[in-house]
Amino acid sequence: ITRQSLDPQRRAAPQQKRSSPTEGLCPPGHHISEDSRECISCKYGQDYSTHWNDFLFCLRCTKCDSGEVEVNSCTTTRNTVCQCEEGTFREEDSPEICRKCRTGCPRGMVKVKDCTPWSDIECVHKESGTKHTGEVPAVEKTVTTSPGTPASPCS
């Protein structure tokens, strides 16, 4: 789930740096004024833009939820990067939640891979060496990932 928004309530502060658009676009770290005449810098730690754009407002920085740790803080050109805390992981199929890693392998199986923020433990049969994937209980905590636009996967 992406938490990106162009917030119409927020207006540029007087101290923000301004420059002229190039080919009608503003560089990363900026947004455009409503009359298209100026590029206005995003506010560090509050909002950002990753590409050349003509956004009327910069994108709001993601705030990591409880159950997540902040790996990289938000800059004017990059969103916050949040990661599942130790003992939990985020699956590609359900990136909106951190799931609890399994504590061990079923009988007759051996652990070959530890829990990481991106994957559960991996178990294989002692004899055959074939993988085993079990159902994992979901942690009741919704979390967010970095911008999910096609051009800017950040986590």
């Epitope: 119409p8 009608g24 676009l25 455009i32 590409h51 994108l59 051009a151």
Partner: nanobody, 126 residues
């Protein structure tokens, strides 16, 4: 929050026409340019057209130039895509997009967007 709502898709015969509409349900599209992308079955999303809502400058993919026309009605907060001389290869889900993103200032084709509509299906078949 910017929300985009497309309409106007449907089934049409080769050579026929359709007009797609994209309305911003909030107060704004959130950006000066608004565009259309499409995704054919089993293919990636591709840029179709965009318009600058301030000055009316238009941008088109080569595959639709001369057949598709993008326009806007700022009073209605709506952007239109008039599609003429439709071909079977135009069959796709068409998405309205705002907050277009570019790798370079000189680029005419955006690499992505922040806001997307839910899409409207256009089927060109006899």
């Amino acid at each position: 929050e910017v929300q985009l709502l497309e309409s106007g898709g449907g089934l049409v015969q080769p050579g026929g026409s359709l007009r797609l509409s994209c309305a911003a349900s909030g107060r704004t599209f959130g950006s000066i340019r608004v565009g259309w992308f499409r995704q054919a079955p089993g293919k990636g999303r591709e840029f179709v057209s965009a318009i600058n809502r301030n000055d009316g400058t238009t941008y088109y993919a080569d595959s639709v130039k001369g057949r598709f026309t993008i326009s806007r009605d700022n009073s209605k907060n709506t952007v239109y895509l008039q599609m003429n001389s439709l071909r079977p290869e135009d069959t796709a889900v068409y998405y309205c997009a705002a907050g277009l993103q570019y790798n370079r200032a000189a680029d005419r084709v955006p690499v992505g967007a922040v806001y997307w509509g839910q899409g409207t299906l256009v089927t060109v078949s006899s």
